[in-house]
Interface confidence: medium
Amino acid sequence: AGLKLMGAPVKLTVSQGQPVKLNCSVEGMEEPDIQWVKDGAVVQNLDQLYIPVSEQHWIGFLSLKSAERSDAGRYWCQVEDGGETEISQPVWLTVEGVPFFTVEPKDLAVPPNAPFQLSCEAVGPPEPVTIVWWRGTTKIGGPAPSPSVLNVTGVTQSTMFSCEAHNLKGLASSRTATVHLQALPAAPFNVTVTKLSSSNASVAWMPGADGRALLQSCTVQVTQAPGGWEVLAVVVPVPPFTCLLRDLVPATNYSLRVRCANALGPSPYADWVPFQTKGLAPASAPQNLHAIRTDSGLILEWEEVIPEGPLEGPLGPYKLSWVQDNGTQDELTVEGTRANLTGWDPQKDLIVRVCVSNAVGCGPWSQPLVVSSHDHAGQQGPPHSRTSWLVPRGSSAHHHHHHHHSAWSHPQFEK
């Protein structure tokens, strides 16, 4: 197969946006499958176009509707003949147009009167490309060859810059870059105490406007009253805009405020936010839990728990928890130190514990009281006789010894 490109010079230059038709003449084959290749890659061309000139002479067309810069390159056509690929002479297609920006000036944020640079680069073809700089509507530099760097000694207000690229085909204007002045950040807002315990507080806030300079840190200041002595000041890197305040005194009134800083300095403080740490949960377990058999069921009694200090606050109701081997279980809340237990099965062992609660939660459980089923069956004493089945289980009221009794495996026993 003798292949040659027909009617096209070796170098073809077209203007951007113009249509291009490359043709390729194939002689010496009856049914060539003409494929076009650009820079080594086969060009997909769904409208395969073959024009028979004669039985062994064909013309293939590659049609580009609108030439773009990306169409520029080295083209050739190829056909397969007896397992061999025949390749035509190449055509170098150049697409000329107004300059194309490869680097445009970027938006910046700078401190007042600080020097900065802006960059601009554009390419042809055709070359050469020259650059002119504009500040607002005033031409301030150039023409200079591309690429170009504009050095600015400083600005005192937000200012617009752009560059213009020129070649023989015309001119192109870059994007407009805005150079903003950096400032101190605005005060944070939505300062919230998100989680409170007796000694810790979690704080979160939303940052105010950053003044176009990266926020570097925020300071959380804590006092025991607004304007009082500073108890704590924590500097946290940001983001995230959160802070954990540790080692606070339980049941105490505090106030906090937050400010954030960028490279230029700190923001104003946000408003004071008051909060109160929680008191302590009761420290003691009720003592001397015992049972009294009555006609109507079982009465449980225990000794009153006295607060160990003001941080525990007022002690509220008692919580009674009981469980049986058959899986029956329940919890009661009672105001006093006495509870009437109903709904249990006297034929099964019964395990009972009690704790005292306050606003924070329940204190430690008492030692468990085990009421055996045979004790119920065998008890012959008169009604209201006081029989105590206090059976210590383990050495600590705070510990759950799962191995002693299957009842301890119930999740309701976990505090």
Partner: antibody, heavy 125, light 108 residues
């Protein structure tokens, strides 16, 4: 005179295989690509894919890639559209289409098209 | 996947000019083709390569393309022009072709 003769209407059950055909006459079959176009009842045209018979090169639309196979038999000047497993959503009219370029004077072609009459495929259980 | 967008319907009175648009991101780079399909018939090519009228098509049919929009214009629409019209083009890299959703032209 250029003619594209398509195979007759067909009714199939879901999961069945099917091949429909388009036989060309009145021109050199290998000169021009043939494409297949689907039209569901009351809906628009959808380009499925094409084949260049002289090289058996194919292109498929993204929705049809892997679901249908386009092939050609140069000896009988016939193009084929094949399904291995039909679905109810394949119910449609299928057209084969062939472009035709004619030079008048120089080498700039004038563009014509020929459409087959269509093959109605119904997939129903 | 690439899409060509057409208005679902266009209505004109006989003798008026009908314009049907087709928009697609690759149309600055790829040619648009227009087809006419009358009820129960196979489609017929009306315009190829944006603006060239296919053989046997009346002169009142013309095509144009600018940027991402191609337009089929029927100057002095006739009752017999009532049909569905489809635009057709390729995706930007030429890997596959697509039809627009079709526009129903009503000539009242």
């Amino acid at each position: 005179e250029v003619q594209l003769v398509q195979s007759g209407a067909d009714v199939k059950k879901p999961g069945a295989s099917l091949t429909i055909s388009c036989q060309a006459s009145g021109y050199t079959f290998t000169d021009y690509w043939i494409s297949w176009v689907r039209q569901k009842p009351g809906k628009g045209l959808e380009w499925m894919g094409q084949i260049v018979p002289r090289a058996s090169r194919t292109n498929y639309g993204p929705s049809f890639q892997g679901h249908v196979t386009i092939s050609a038999d140069r000896s009988t000047a016939t193009a084929y559209l094949q399904w291995r497993s039909l679905e109810a959503s394949d119910t449609a009219m299928y057209y084969c289409v062939r472009p035709y370029f004619q030079t008048s004077g120089g080498t700039i072609p004038e563009y014509y098209q020929h459409w087959g009459p269509g093959t109605l495929v119904t997939v129903s259980s | 996947s690439y899409e060509l967008t057409q208005p679902p319907s266009v209505s004109v009175s006989p003798g008026q000019t009908a314009r049907i648009t087709c928009s697609g991101d690759a149309l600055p780079k790829k040619y648009a083709y227009w087809y006419q399909q009358k009820s129960g018939q196979a489609p017929v090519l009306v315009i190829y390569e944006d603006e060239k009228r296919a053989s046997g098509i009346p002169e009142r049919f013309s095509g144009s393309s600018s940027g991402t929009m191609a337009t089929l214009t029927i100057s002095g629409a006739q009752v017999e022009d009532e049909a569905d019209y489809y635009c057709y083009s390729q995706e930007r890299n030429g890997n596959y072709a697509v039809f627009g959703g079709g526009t129903k032209l009503t000539v009242l």
